[in-house]
């Protein structure tokens, strides 16, 4: 027994190290032999029969969403949807798990990350990690050539997930993509716009677009002396300029990527410039790279692609910055992502760290890699990275103290008396039956102060009172929570007085 | 029975290399991790070095680090210290022990000692 | 590194005393600690780790407390075999290191 009491005690100890390894932010190297030694220790702990201690929690990287968080995703979700619909986008779902060889070889360093299912019946599943290769699996299946679709659904990501920035194992993208064969830039421009246009409604603060294309990163490590095998893998270490200093960065490419000193040193040359259109006409005149037939395409194509930005007011918002190489394998084009500039922390607030808040890019050899003959179907889009978004909104709502409704009870049927639980259900059937949203206590007798604080916790606007003599009258009071003022109002003008006070459409259309 | 038995040690000149072995025995020697300690003549003791069951990690006093190599062969639950360009002050008995409850760097089972002197 | 300063350096008590070693952290150490009994010519004897977890088949007169940077050894009636050397060492982060000492003698 006192053993068993030594070894928890060391768990416990145990497990406060490794927390406050990670705080510190101590070298992984670290963190994993102290997190190795916490799981010996429990091993060997074993279950104790005595008091089964089964710790009740969602797993890790997840999280359940309260009534208040979920008010305030839809908030979010409708900003969104209301902007993808505005840009005339269909929608459509697939499954939350695809065969395992779907996934594969599309995501490059990141396929490590692709939850896989056990075991179904001889199918190879995997719980999908993103919602564009799905999407491409959907046109080459169904043979579509041309769509316009957005999809909000969750995706599943084996990550190491800081939960307080933002970043689940589970969590949901909101993508938009227009599939087909167009004028170039013209639907790489539309996405950008309605990156911006979503941002903006959202009102979390300053942000700012990074663009670059991938053609301009291989044209560019071409002439710089990386080898085709390296590009990949090199593009993954340039990623990281926005986290890390670019000694850093050149210290992984030569130490651990095995790049040549002055060929890193040629690529920072290029990678730590950003700007605008300038320094896309700077990088046409450049000797080297106008020389490489596929920056030179890049660079002809960001070139149209700003003049599209101007046309659509958000050329303010975009930079073209060299050091994005947005880790996934699929894009070949244009590539962007939105990060914001400063998080709208109060005075004295830690501002919120959740770096990107929506990214994209345009992948044209996607589709084909599902196409028995390979035929191609050109492909751009954008995904919304809610989850941050979400953190952000409630923090800051948080912050404000803002009062969130998590209901949209227009109206409690209340009663001033005893015995009028009849009456009262009666009243509230014909609510709903018009379409207002009422809601009534679930008690025979309930005193009306109770039913008046119930409006003031929920924010429920209106209260309608039955009373004795109302019902002789053939009247309601109609009362308004905040101001409390009541007036009597025929029974038959309830309704339209409602949804009058509450703005509601006078039909239900 | 559960117990640890150091070898190797003797005199050495300054400049020399030994290797130090430790046999242990009566325990899954391989679900520990290991470690030397050292105690100069008539002083205190001193961490040396440590290696877990796995082989994956090892740490080095700063005092050895890059003149001394912690090794173990699990199959033949045996744990080595291969000590080069070895100086004066390395002079010590070496205790190789091992740690309570598999990882914690406290040390439950210790060997005899075996004496190691560097001396011109 | 952390240091770890025993007092006192040596003590003579008579046998069925209640005697008392300290040992203070450079720096706070949760309780990573542990004591150690050496008898000359021998490799020390774990006798409690942990803080205040006593080691298996160590007798209970023999107790540990304390924790962060201040920690305590008590033996609550001394034995004749309990005069020795004691030491503290502490296991929180490597390299782990020891008290230098603490000689018990009889008085």
């Known amino acids: 027994m006192a053993e068993r009491a030594a070894l928890e005690e060391l768990v416990k100890l145990q497990g406060e190290r490794v927390r406050g390894l990670k705080q510190q932010k101590a070298s992984a190297e670290l963190i994993e032999e102290e997190v190795a030694k916490l799981l010996k220790l429990k091993a060997q702990l074993g279950p104790d029969e005595s008091k089964q201690k089964f710790v009740l929690k969602t797993p890790k990287g997840t999280r359940d969403y309260s009534p208040r968080q979920m008010a305030v995703r839809e908030k979010v979700f409708d900003v969104i949807i209301r902007c993808f619909k505005r840009h005339g986008a269909e929608v459509i779902d697939t499954p939350v798990f695809e065969l395992k060889e779907t996934l594969m070889g599309k995501y490059g360093e990141d396929s490590k990350l692709i939850y896989d299912l056990k075991d179904q019946g001889g199918e190879l599943l995997s719980l999908r990690y993103d919602l564009t290769v799905p999407f491409a699996r959907y046109l080459a299946m169904n043979k579509l050539t041309n769509i316009k679709r957005y999809h909000i659904a969750k995706v599943y990501r084996r990550d190491n997930p800081a939960m307080t920035r933002g970043r689940y194992r589970e969590f949901y993208q909101c993508d938009f993509d227009i599939a087909g064969n167009f004028d170039p830039m013209i639907p790489d421009a539309e996405c950008l716009k309605i990156m911006c246009e979503i941002l903006s409604s959202l009102q979390i603060g300053d942000f700012l677009v990074k663009v670059n294309d991938r053609r301009i990163l291989d044209g560019m490590f071409a002439i710089c002396g990386v080898s085709d095998s390296k590009f990949r893998t090199i593009c993954s270490s340039v990623d990281k300029l926005d986290k890390v200093s670019w000694e850093e960065v050149k210290n992984e490419m030569v130490g651990e990527k095995g790049l040549a000193p002055e060929v890193a040193d040629r690529i920072g040359d290029y990678v730590q410039q950003h700007g605008g259109v300038s320094l896309v006409e700077q990088l046409l005149q450049d000797p080297k790279l106008s020389q490489n037939k596929q920056a030179l395409e890049g660079l002809g194509d960001l070139k149209l692609l700003f003049e599209y930005l101007t046309l659509f007011g958000i050329d303010d918002k975009i930079s073209f910055d060299l050091s994005l190489a947005r880790g996934l394998d699929y894009y070949t084009g244009v590539i962007y992502e939105a990060v914001l500039l400063q998080t709208p922390a109060q005075a004295g607030e830690e501002p919120l760290g959740v770096g990107s808040v929506a990214a994209g890019g345009r992948y044209d050899g996607l589709v084909g890699m599902f196409d028995p003959k390979g035929r191609k179907v050109p492909c751009v889009g954008l995904s919304i990275g809610v989850e941050r978004i979400f953190s952000i909104v409630e923090q800051r709502l948080e912050a404000l103290e803002e009062k969130i409704r998590t209901t949209e009870t227009q109206v409690l049927v209340a009663s001033a008396q005893k015995k009028l639980l009849e009456e009262r259900l009666k009243l509230v059937s014909e609510l709903w039956d018009a379409g207002i949203k009422a809601e009534l206590l679930y008690k025979k007798n309930p005193k009306l102060l109770n039913q008046l604080q119930y409006c003031e916790e929920a924010g429920i606007p209106l209260v309608a009172i039955i009373g004795e003599q109302e019902l002789k009258d053939g009247v309601i009071k109609l009362r308004s929570v905040t101001s409390r003022e009541e007036v009597d109002v025929r029974r038959e003008d309830l309704v339209e007085e409602i949804k009058r006070r509450t703005g509601q459409p006078l039909c239900i259309c | 029975q559960v117990q640890l038995v150091e070898s190797g040690g003797g005199l050495v000149k300054p400049g020399g290399s030994l290797r130090l072995s430790c046999a242990a025995s009566?325990?899954?020697?391989?679900?520990?991790?290991m470690t030397w300690i050292r105690q100069a003549p008539g002083k205190g003791l001193e961490w040396v070095s440590y290696?877990?069951?796995?082989?994956?990690?090892?740490n080095y006093a700063p005092s050895v680090k890059g003149r001394f190599t912690i090794s173990r062969d699990n199959a033949k639950n045996s744990l080595y210290l291969q000590m080069n360009s070895l100086r004066d002050e390395d002079t010590a008995v070496y205790f190789c022990?091992?740690?309570?409850?598999?990882?914690?760097?406290?040390?439950?089972?210790w060997g005899q000692g075996t004496l190691v002197t560097v001396s011109s | 590194d952390i240091q770890m300063t025993q007092s006192p350096s040596s003590v003579s008590a008579s046998v069925g005393d209640r005697v008392t070693i300290t040992c203070r952290a450079s720096?706070?150490?949760?309780?990573?600690l542990a004591w150690y009994q050496q008898k000359p010519g021998r490799a020390p004897k774990l006798l409690i780790f942990a803080a205040s977890s006593l080691q298996s088949g160590v007798p209970s007169r023999f107790s540990g407390s304390g924790s962060g940077t201040h920690f305590t050894l008590t033996i609550s009636s001394l034995q004749p075999e309990d005069f020795a050397t004691y030491y503290c060492?502490?296991?929180?982060?490597?390299?782990?290191?020891f008290g230098q000492g603490t000689k018990l003698e009889i008085k």
């Open positions: 060492q502490q296991a929180e982060s490597f390299p782990y290191t």
């Open positions: 720096q706070g150490i949760s309780s990573w």
């Open positions: 022990a091992r740690y309570v409850y598999q990882v914690v760097a406290i040390g439950d089972l």
């Open positions: 290696i877990s069951g796995s082989f994956r990690y090892t």
């Open positions: 009566g325990f899954t020697f391989s679900d520990y991790y």
